[in-house]
């Protein structure tokens, strides 16, 4: 038989991570595999169909996501959709192939929202979540000793589909659920000057724990104010929600794990500033097999998309794609086994969620809701060489930190500063505010 | 040849305005009169097929009304869509229509992003829209002398598809392009104590002209908390938009035309309160026809839809889809006529664009981009008998108020407040900081 | 009305010392950097010195790094440019200019100047 | 530190033309470019901010584009009142650099 897998992802723009040149290769790499192996889907022929979630300009679309998704179900009748990967492209399809019964896998569509299934019914995202970057954040406050207070900062940039308002709204959600904790959260425009003057006074005022999601250049200049006004690494902690490790990447940027680095006459001050700072990403898959496919899917990338994929976190996306269709192949193999059909979308779904895999991306776990359990790399500065590297990975299926051997968190007092400082953050403390002399009553 | 209408609006739940229970009569009506004039489509059979735009719950659905308008285009490809109302039913259908080069007529969705029609392509918008709103409240702005300041609230309800959201963007956005003022705005939860003491603390900070979106209890409640903390009408002034009048209506609710009137013991400070108070809202069509098509409507909507329709200004909505939709009949009828086709809806819809037109709902005029010019009425006491009565008029077309003979605008110290006052919000203006003897020197 | 007024230029020997001083009004001083920019006569703008704030960051040209001093007081609204071991080639207009940023880590332009204060070093 | 080399030094044109003035910088300074316009006795002016934004009060004539290390300043109609010298400035590093001017004046 024939199954067809209807495609909604960015044809022409190669910038998202979940943009056809990128997940393309990533495809044909997973339906060589079904073929080579007489386990999967046997005398079935997979074919995909493709439909683009851009505009004209380009741009992830809320319009033309949905609109190919309508054009590809009603020409094809696919047994899938692969993808919208960016938010509010996915948004949209995502409630249609719910409301047809279609099952949707994608490795993009992070956002909170998408985590609802009585409305994203069918939809699996064999991909990291913005929700599960709130586990990773609360297992790091319980082990920090953190469970009073966070202060969560999050950027606005024109043209960036409001990627740090959806990171931050799944961190926030989550935490709160997780941690009896308060967190503020505060949104600045990083091309607008007076909005820096506002952080730097609301800063001190909420929060000692700060998380920042921002451009590597928003970020630094936030440090090199805080340095400025005092915010030191003994009282504060800033944590750069830098999921895909921009600014340690170094390229036409900072030099490759020195996020500080520019050039630019600030340096000196950005390294000492930079000792407040630590650097949440998504984890490096470190198993060969990982290695291997990067191998392969840059080959293909460039041999049939002429699209040189560059090096860097990224790739794990395309990786969760190929990853997630091998997957849901399976489940389907399995479904026809028991009598089922390509088209009962419920029952092939259910065989994909609360479910282990061995992938390329290494041990994966789709969660009973069909959301992958996410691992998560928190990096600091060697204060030898100002050099980041990875000191703790969390392991989203066990929910466990785990600690690089050999190499510690580094803290100016050798601890943890407090979440809220001694005398509270308007010195509202009693104790704090009583005559100096009162000691000798 | 034949002609299809496909409308997509609420087909079961009958509270929305433009509820197919109350829309449905409006639109036999029109089809009656198009049988009925040899000068209109002549030989051209007109049909309706129906989508509902609700979800299962009978709620407005951003995805069962473009799903219904994607059926509804595959299985009939009609000519024109009609509807939907719901802002958030009609932002995705518009974006596909648009994409299909289809017309789109409603008399709703009045949300200030419909106006943007490169987006909203051949959508024509034949009620009222927030932003002509900011056209009124800019002359009256004008005529009054209010061109420094205003302040702006707005009431979040659960399940109210943020109306008064939409309403005040559309407003403020329109109000600060047409005068160069400095306007803020809040949000406030009707079921939040909290919220209430906030917005005390806020409005003598920040306005003495104060517009506000509110069920009327919500209104009536902030007009209490006003006179309690001594906001009188001597220095601010409290404008309800209660665009559909439901505050003066009678029935369950207040008093017709007292608002101020609930019979639980606080009618007397509520009376008093409400001298700082106006009203705003559409303006009731005051022409003979519209009064003859009410009697209409209400029988057809009997008789039909078992359906019975309550008076108010909630009826300028179905008025307004047959005016539209006659509109859109004449812009055919002339398309033919030059020798184009249904199909042709570019050139259909510019000639209903910038046109005038004598409806039922009386003069009617579209704008340049496919916009109504809107009427309103502001409504004052009397401070005779406490009964709230219009005493002015806006005419959208000719962008004037027109004042009702006989009646005044009713300022407690005989002209309106100033919208800054005199020493500034916080005190600030050095002339009232000095000490009170300089004077003698 | 936003204003800057520089004073306490004038005509020093090389080799002394001379403050420079400009007063700030209508607007909220401690919201932003301040910069201090010369002229010599006939010739271009060049960039002296800047600082932050608070203080917390103070930049130099490396033609006046170690000789100049540059400081504010935000209770007077006031900024400062103490300039030892003066040159001839220091001679020029001197420009106080406001920032359009809090800090000198931001890239905010230079929106508000002064008329400028004359400096000649000469013997 | 940071080169900002301009380019002509100076121009002749007439009222009407199109006025174009480039600036580089000797490394990536992003978009964090600025131009100033100054007339004779006078103090300088802001007229873009970050390589196109224009300030407010400033004609829409001007105009500014480029990042990284190439920019340009265009003036699309010339007025009398636009005679003057212009500069370029980066606000990416420290110390803060101009370029050495480009005089406009009357053909």
């Known amino acids: 038989g024939n199954l067809t897998v209807a495609v909604v992802l960015p044809l022409a723009n190669t910038s998202y991570p979940w943009s056809w040149a990128r997940v393309g290769p990533a495809v044909e790499l997973a339906l060589a595999q079904v073929k080579a192996r007489p386990d999967l889907l046997p005398g079935w022929t997979v074919r995909t169909v493709l439909g683009s979630s851009e505009n004209a300009l380009g741009v992830c679309s809320d319009t033309a996501a949905p609109l190919a998704a309508v054009d590809l179900k009603w020409e094809h009748n696919p047994a899938v959709f692969l993808g919208p990967g960016c938010v509010y492209a996915a948004a949209p399809v995502g409630r249609f192939t719910a409301h047809w019964r279609v099952p949707l896998l994608t490795a993009g569509a992070p956002a909170l929202g998408f985590g609802v299934k009585d409305e994203y019914a069918l939809t699996t995202r064999a991909g990291p979540s913005y929700a599960k970057l709130g586990d990773f954040v609360a297992a790091l406050h319980r082990r920090l000793g953190w469970e009073r207070q966070a202060l969560m900062l999050y950027a606005y940039r024109p043209g960036d589909e409001e990627h740090c308002f959806f990171l931050v709204e799944g961190l926030f959600m989550r935490v709160r659920d997780r941690l009896n904790i308060t967190v503020d959260h505060l949104e600045f425009a990083e091309d607008d000057l007076s909005h820096y003057t506002r952080l730097l006074r609301t800063m001190p005022r909420k929060g000692r724990v700060i998380y920042i999601c921002s451009s590597p250049d928003a970020f630094r200049t936030l440090m090199l104010l805080a340095l400025e006004a005092g915010l030191c690494g003994e009282d504060y902690v800033f944590f750069h929600l830098d999921i895909f490790g921009q600014s340690l990447q170094g390229g036409q940027g900072p030099a490759p794990r020195r996020p500080w680095e520019r050039g630019d006459g600030q340096d000196v001050s950005a390294r000492q500033a930079f000792q407040a700072a630590k650097i949440i990403t998504y984890k490096d898959p470190d198993n060969p097999e990982y290695l291997e496919f990067l191998k392969q899917l840059k080959h293909l990338a460039y041999e049939q998309f002429n699209f040189t994929m560059e090096d860097g976190l990224v790739n794990t996306i395309p990786a969760s794609f190929h990853d997630g269709l091998l997957l849901y192949i399976q489940a389907v193999t399995e479904t026809l086994a028991h009598g089922g059909t390509v088209t009962d979308g419920e029952n092939i779904t259910q065989r994909m969620w609360n479910r282990s895999f061995q992938g390329v991306t290494g041990y994966l776990k789709i969660d009973s809701s069909g959301d992958r359990e996410t691992d998560f790399s928190l990096w600091d500065m060697d204060p030898e060489n100002g050099a980041f590297r990875v000191v703790l990975n969390y392991n989203g299926t066990s929910q466990e930190l785990v600690a690089v051997s050999g190499r510690k968190l580094n803290w100016p007092l050798g601890y943890p500063p407090p979440d809220i400082p001694k005398c509270g953050f308007d010195n509202e403390d009693p104790a704090c505010n009583q005559d100096h002399l009162s000691t000798l009553e | 040849g034949n002609l299809t209408v496909a409308v997509v609006l609420p087909l079961a739940n009958t509270s929305y305005p433009w509820s197919w229970a109350r829309v449905g009569p409006a639109v036999e009506l029109a089809l009656a009169q198009v049988k009925a004039r040899p000068d209109l489509l002549p030989g051209w059979t007109v049909r309706t097929v129906l989508g509902s735009s609700e979800n299962a719950l009978g709620v407005c659905s951003d995805t069962a009304a473009p799903l219904a308008a994607v059926d509804l285009k595959w299985e009939h490809n009609p000519a024109v869509f009609l509807g939907p109302g719901c802002v958030y039913a009609a932002a995705p259908v518009g974006r596909f229509t648009a994409h299909w080069r289809v017309p789109l007529l409603t008399a709703g969705a009045p949300a200030l992003g419909f106006g943007v029609k490169d987006e909203y392509a051949l959508t024509t918008r034949a009620g009222p829209s927030y932003a002509k709103l900011g056209d009124f409240v800019a002359a009256l702005h004008r005529r009054l002398g209010w061109e420094r300041q205003a302040l702006m609230l707005y009431a979040y309800r659960p399940g109210d598809e943020e109306h008064c959201f939409f309403l005040v963007e559309g407003l403020f956005m329109r109000v600060r392009d047409r005068l160069n003022i400095t306007v803020d705005h809040l949000e406030f939860a009707e079921d939040d104590l909290s919220h209430y003491t906030r917005l005390l603390r806020t409005m003598p900070r920040k306005g003495r002209v104060i517009y506000i979106c509110s069920s009327p209890d919500a209104f009536r409640t902030l007009m209490l908390l006003a006179l309690e903390a001594g906001l009188c009408g001597e220095d601010y002034v409290f404008f309800h938009l209660d665009i559909f009048g439901q505050s003066l209506q009678g029935g369950q609710g207040p008093a017709p035309r007292r608002p101020w009137e609930r019979g639980d013991g606080q009618d007397v400070s509520a009376r008093q309160a409400f001298q700082a108070a106006k009203i705003i809202t559409y303006k009731d069509p005051d022409n003979p026809e519209y009064l003859e098509f009410l009697k209409q409507l209400k029988h057809l909507a009997y008789e039909q839809f078992n359906f019975t329709m309550e008076d108010g200004l909630v009826n300028t909505i179905p008025a307004s889809f047959h005016d539209g939709l006659l509109l859109y009949i004449q812009a055919v009828t002339e398309t033919l006529a030059h020798g184009g086709t249904v199909t042709d809806g570019e050139n259909i819809t510019q000639r209903m664009w910038n046109r005038s037109f004598q409806g039922v709902t009386g003069y009617l005029k579209i704008d340049s981009s496919g916009d109504r010019e809107t009427d309103f009425s502001l409504w004052d006491m009397d401070p005779e008998n406490g009964a709230f009565r219009v005493v002015l008029n806006y005419n959208g077309t000719s962008q004037e108020l027109v004042a009702v003979s006989g009646r005044k605008l009713n300022w407690p110290l005989g002209y309106p407040p100033p919208d800054i006052p005199k020493c500034g919000f916080d005190n600030e203006d050095p002339a009232c900081n000095q000490d009170h003897l300089s004077t003698l020197e | 009305e936003v204003q800057l007024v520089e004073s306490g230029g004038g005509l020093v020997q090389p080799g002394r010392s001379l403050r420079l001083s400009c007063a700030a009004s209508?607007?909220?001083?401690?919201?932003?950097?301040m910069h201090w920019v010369r002229q010599a006569p006939g010739k271009g703008l060049e960039w002296v010195s800047g600082i932050s704030w608070n203080s917390g960051t103070i930049g130099y040209a490396d033609s006046v790094k170690g000789r100049f001093t540059m400081s504010r007081d935000n209770a007077k609204n006031s900024l400062y440019l103490q300039m030892n071991s003066l040159r001839p080639e220091d001679t020029a207009l001197y420009y106080c200019?406001?920032?359009?940023?809090?800090?000198?880590?931001?890239?905010?332009?230079?929106?508000?100047w002064g008329q400028g204060t004359m400096v000649t070093v000469s013997s | 530190d940071i080169q900002m080399t301009q380019s002509p030094s100076s121009l002749s044109a007439s009222v009407g033309d199109k006025v174009t003035i480039t600036c580089r910088a000797s490394?990536?300074?992003?978009?964090?470019l600025n131009w100033y316009q100054q007339k004779p006795g006078k103090a300088p002016k802001v007229l873009i901010s970050?390589?196109?934004s224009l300030q407010s009060g400033v004609p829409s004539r001007f105009s500014g584009s480029g990042s990284g290390t190439d920019f340009t300043l265009t003036i699309s109609s010339l007025q009398p009142e636009d005679f003057a010298v212009f500069y370029c400035q980066q606000s990416f590093g420290i110390p803060r650099t101009f370029g050495q001017g480009t005089k406009v004046e009357i053909k």
């Open positions: 209508g607007f909220t001083f401690d919201d932003y950097a």
């Open positions: 970050t390589a196109s």
């Open positions: 200019a406001k920032d359009m940023g809090v800090s000198l880590a931001l890239w905010g332009a230079f929106d508000i």
């Open positions: 490394q990536n300074i992003r978009t964090y």
